[in-house]
């Protein structure tokens, strides 16, 4: 029979979807026990049918990877979890709908920092997400967001920054004494969609000057 | 070295249709933010519409919405613009151009596209 | 969507006079902000990106600066082939806008 609240068994069903990696999770209610088991279903807006997820079914695990099922970035998304205890009470609960574009939250760039001897060269590697082109190759978030920026930033000293920021992937502060450690960070921001990363860090030493020694 | 040539411009009633393509070379055509921009006579650039060659994602003008359809043929190196619904506000030299390394930075040469009664 | 107000809208130079072009952003684009060079009967070409940064193959007499959401192009010493039309674009989000643009004469 079915508890009074699905919440005894079941609470927080949510997907946490990150550079487009699409994890649904939950927890166990207060009446949750650890042979509870959990099966999976997912669909599309505007569907009617429920898919059962092969390999989310009676499972005792509160995660399901639904990055495949979920990878179309133009559609809306549902998904629900059944839990069934030992004593055979069971309970279900649904998701909001989701958007991968817009609920995912994105992971610090990948960066390469060169130093010189009065610049710190910054390359921004594209970050792979784990979606497919018709052509097979994984696209990056650079192909999905047409407006995605690079924000750089060098820590000079404790009162002063320098920037730089753009599309490109290549960029270098110039005008910086030699022989010098600076701090960079790197975020991708994208402002359509008010998405902003974690940054990535760099701790650099510019290169000692060798032509006056 | 690269090149974008546009063609398929020319006069059409309003109302009709016309399809503008662009042929590109000298980069990696399938992996590319591909746009179409015009000019009126005598006017100042508006983008019109943009496309991902990889992903397929595409954007377009408030005022143009509706009306045409951005796509490509990735094995032919081919951009296209399908205009519907034509407007003689429409009357325009169409350009097309692409992102390389961060910058809109290389351009074709332009076709007239103008719509008249 | 971010409007780009440009001005002036036309200016006449002599040779060798300093000139500048401003574009004032109605919201923040950072420093996602391009100038263009665009000749009759052409298309536009690149001068300056992400604000202050020149295009390689474009004399140093062009220079970019941003103060806010406030942009400038600067040409140092204008020369006859500067007659044109300059255009700043802002790149920093769907529609991309340019501003209305600057028809520069040579006296």
């Known amino acids: 029979h079915a508890p009074e609240d699905p919440s005894d068994l079941l609470q927080h069903v949510k997907f946490q979807s990150s550079n487009f990696e699409n994890i649904l999770t939950w927890d166990s209610g207060p009446e949750g026990t650890p042979d509870t088991v959990y099966s999976i279903e997912y669909k599309t807006y505007g569907e009617r049918d429920w898919v059962a997820k092969k390999g989310c079914q009676r499972i005792t695990r509160k995660s399901c990877n639904l990055t495949v099922e979920t990878g179309n970035l133009t559609e809306l998304y549902y998904a629900r979890v059944t839990a069934v205890s030992a004593g055979g009470r069971s309970a279900t609960k649904m998701t909001d709908r989701f958007s991968s574009l817009q609920h995912t939250t994105l992971k610090p760039p990948d960066v390469t920092c060169i130093s010189k001897v009065r610049s710190i060269q910054m390359i921004v590697h594209p970050t792979p997400t784990p979606i497919r082109a018709g052509d097979g190759h994984r696209l990056t978030l650079e192909d999905i967001f047409h407006d995605l920026f690079y924000h750089l930033e060098l820590q000079v000293n404790r009162t002063y920054q320098m920037h730089l920021g753009g599309k490109q992937r290549e960029y270098e502060f110039f005008g910086l004494t030699p022989d010098t450690e600076f701090l960079g960070t790197i975020m991708i921001c994208v402002p359509t969609w008010a998405k902003e990363s974690a940054p990535y860090m760099c701790r650099v030493k510019t290169l000692p000057d060798r032509t006056w020694t | 070295e690269v090149q974008l040539v546009e063609s398929g411009g020319g006069l059409v009633q309003p109302g009709g249709s016309l399809r503008l393509s662009c042929a590109a070379s000298?980069?990696?055509?399938?992996?590319?933010?591909m746009y179409w921009v015009r000019q009126a006579p005598g006017k100042g650039l508006e983008f019109v519409s943009v496309?991902?060659?990889?992903?397929?994602?595409?954007h377009y003008v408030e005022s143009v919405k509706g009306r045409f359809t951005i796509s490509t043929d990735n094995a032919k190196n081919t951009l296209f613009l399908q205009m519907n619904s034509l407007k003689s506000e429409d009357t325009a030299v169409y350009y097309c151009?692409?992102?390389?390394?961060?910058?809109?930075?290389?351009w074709g040469q332009g076709t007239q596209v103008t719509v008249s009664s | 969507d971010i409007v780009m107000t440009q001005s002036p809208s036309s200016l006449s130079a002599s040779l060798g006079d300093r000139v500048t072009v401003t574009c004032q952003a109605s919201?923040?684009?950072?420093?996602?902000l391009n100038w263009y060079q665009q000749k009759p009967g052409q298309a536009p070409k690149l001068l300056i990106y992400?604000?202050?940064r020149l295009r390689i193959g474009v004399p140093s007499r062009f220079s970019g600066s941003a103060s806010g959401t406030s942009f400038t192009l600067t040409i140092s010493g204008v020369e006859s082939e500067d007659l044109a039309t300059y255009y700043c674009?802002?790149?920093?989000?769907?529609?991309?806008?340019f501003g209305s643009g600057t028809r520069l004469e040579i006296k």
């Open positions: 151009a692409t992102r390389i390394q961060g910058l809109i930075d290389y």
């Open positions: 000298g980069f990696t055509f399938s992996s590319s933010w």
């Open positions: 496309i991902n060659t990889r992903s397929g994602i595409t």
């Open positions: 919201q923040s684009i950072r420093s996602s």
């Open positions: 992400g604000a202050s």
């Open positions: 674009l802002q790149d920093y989000t769907w529609p991309l806008s």
